[in-house]
Amino acid sequence: LRILPEVKVEGELGGSVTIKCPLPEMHVRIYLCREMAGSGTCGTVVSTTNFIKAEYKGRVTLKQYPRKNLFLVEVTQLTESDSGVYACGAGMNTDRGKTQKVTLNVHSEYEPSWEEQPMPETPKWFHLPYLFQMPAYASSSKFVTRVTTPAQRGKVPPVHHSSPTTQITHRPRVSRASSVAGDKPRTFLPSTTASKISALEGLLKPQTPSYNHHTRLHRQRALDYGSQSGREGQG
């Protein structure tokens, strides 16, 4: 029983991660699998035989870099449920050819500790005791959304806002991993997927400022409030 090298990968909720795996010399099926709690088996997530596990469809890609002796698996639109133990491997039997263990932890951005981070000071001459004489502030209920482009700044009429009830579809976030130079990657995501995603994005583009605000609000909340545990308040 050989001990596998282990790597830990941190991912941000809604973001993406790239898992780096060793690539064997011989031309053989390679894969990323996920260890199933309880059963001890490792279920294929993605492999070079064009298999993609259902819950990862449209958000996982596998690219090989033979000259670098590695392959990369990118997972986008991360959710809490993606946290877990994965393994890279090679060979026809997913359970047998593991080369590296990968622990993925998906979380909201880490909130700096209260004690550790010095609080930035406001200008010394802006005296806070003066600030303290304030009555309760009542805000206006009227708000306006504006889309600003380099060419123009157009105003739209005020929109009535209520809590978001729209079904949200996230656009896949661009990967932060830098690509590996020197190789043209071989991608094993079915070729139609990219065009389908782009067509879908066209269809799903928010039609109104209100929808746009709520769609984005949902995503921001997922980033900031989505997977906090204990005291890791994100924001």
């Epitope: 973001g15 959304t145 600003t148 806002h161 909340r221 900031d224 924001g235």
Partner: antibody, heavy 114, light 111 residues
Amino acid sequence: QVQLQQPGAELVRPGSSVKLSCKASGYTFTNHWLHWVKQRPIQGLEWIGYIDPSDSLTHYNQNFKDKATLTVDKSSSTAYMQLSSLTSEDSAVYYCARFSFAYWGQGTLVTVSA
Amino acid sequence: DVVMTQTPLTLSVTIGQPASISCKSSQSLLDSDGKTYLNWLLQRPGQSPKRLIYLVSKLDSGVPDRFTGSGSGTDFTLKISRVEAEDLGVYYCWQGTHLWTFGGGTKLEIK
């Protein structure tokens, strides 16, 4: 760590405009909305609006729609707020803060005075 | 209008004693996603505000457990079990369910 850097103070003339900056670091700038908040003596904290740095979509409190203009420069990870037609009522500390107000800049004191 | 009303305006407390601040909203802050976006900030003298509590009762990293947040719907409370000198400043509640609104602030001063 996440930081939002703002200049300490701006002294401006009535009727003019001022552009305040907020330089973000320690996180992916385009992933998180940035809010702007006004703090005046007596009035407390007042939400001005937010900008989504990924594509500059903005959302304003109606009270500030003709006063404030929010923009970003992605290349320098900096957000800006321009305040126009300044009066003494605009004298305040202006903060930028990230989406759920867990991270704040140190604030810029704007003083409107002849 | 979502108006956030905080009471009292000023709170004078002896070190080691408990303190309680109330925050009432003019409409329910329970969102359609099942979460209540009611949060608390502390602005210490000469500093920027700092978030203490989010989603009614969750403490931010590093916030001492003498702070507790509670409430639902429209009525919320921030409690400090034993006030310490570093707790002085102005406490604000704010809501993020219906855009963003801040309460008027409660100044905590040490007797």
